[in-house]
């Protein structure tokens, strides 16, 4: 599995009328990237 | 296989609450985001809520048209995910979806009407 | 919010065929670290949505290859080389890195 992303969550970080999480976590947080095995939907990215 | 099963949904009166579960079952849940989607009759998707894992503090996000009226939460140890609905309005008629962002639920129907 | 507009709303297809789905977003969808967050998704007929692609390229296991994600970071599309019968339904494009996270109108393919 490719490593994770840096997790910089940003709840509490306004911009206008927007909460940015800056980067893209839900792949590292899928339901695919928790089944350690068998084929996955979310393949590691190369 | 990896399940996720909404219920809860029904009729109810404008202004009234509504309970949603979604039961999940064949992949470890804990650390997991979940969300909530929303599909009006014949309409788009609409994302309307979404909770993180306990290792972000169980983070909630919610769409402008249900924050304050709407609640998501989740129970690790039962491996399900919540929607508490307050202060239902018409709009709020919809099939509600849960999922994972890769895989989804069949849906649970909510209808708001006097 | 991050408006996701696709075009067409509607397409007609021809089995075998090549078909390709706009959806651009108001904003960049590309973040720091080289992703970006756009997804493709189908949902056929009394379905709940699948997953086609994921940050716009990738494509999820057990499409069919002949589906494929491309695009920059405001403008991307989705190409479906030869369409085949249970391709049609509804796409969405969506994007999951702004709050609210935005799906676009859909777009309705239909065998001609």
């Known amino acids: 599995l490719a490593d994770p992303l840096d997790h910089r969550d940003a709840g509490d970080l306004w911009f206008p009328g927007e909460s940015e999480s800056f980067e893209d976590a839900h792949v590292e947080h899928s339901i695919s990237r928790s089944l350690l095995e068998g084929e996955i939907p979310f393949p590691p990215t190369s | 296989e990896v399940q996720l099963v909404e219920s809860g949904g029904g009729l109810v009166q404008p202004g009234g609450s509504l309970k949603l579960s979604c039961a999940t079952s064949?992949?470890?849940?804990?650390?997991?985001?979940m969300h909530w989607v929303r599909q009006a009759s014949g309409k788009g998707l609409e994302w309307i809520a979404h909770i993180k894992a306990k290792s972000d503090n169980y983070a909630t996000y919610y769409a402008e048209s249900v924050k304050g009226r709407f609640t998501i939460s989740r129970d690790d140890s039962k491996t399900t995910i919540y929607l508490q609905m307050n202060s239902l309005k018409t709009e709020d008629t919809a099939v509600y979806y849960c999922?994972?962002?890769?895989?989804w639920g069949q849906g649970t129907t909510v209808t708001v009407s006097s | 919010d991050v408006v996701m507009t696709q075009s067409p709303l509607s397409l007609p297809v021809t089995p075998g065929e090549p078909a390709s789905i706009s959806c651009r977003s108001s904003?960049?969808?590309?973040?720091?670290?080289?992703?970006?967050?756009l997804y493709w998704y189908l949902q056929k007929p009394g379905q709940s949505p699948q997953l086609l692609i994921y940050r716009m390229s990738n494509l999820a296991s057990g499409v069919p290859d002949r589906f494929s994600g491309s695009g920059s970071g405001t403008d991307f599309t989705l190409k479906i080389s030869r369409v085949e019968a249970e391709d049609v339904g509804v796409y969405y494009c969506a994007q999951f890195l702004v709050y609210p996270y935005t799906f676009g109108q859909g777009t309705k393919v239909e065998i001609k």
């Open positions: 064949g992949f470890p849940f804990s650390n997991v985001w």
């Open positions: 904003r960049s969808l590309l973040t720091s670290k080289g992703i970006t967050s």
């Open positions: 999922t994972g962002l890769d895989y």
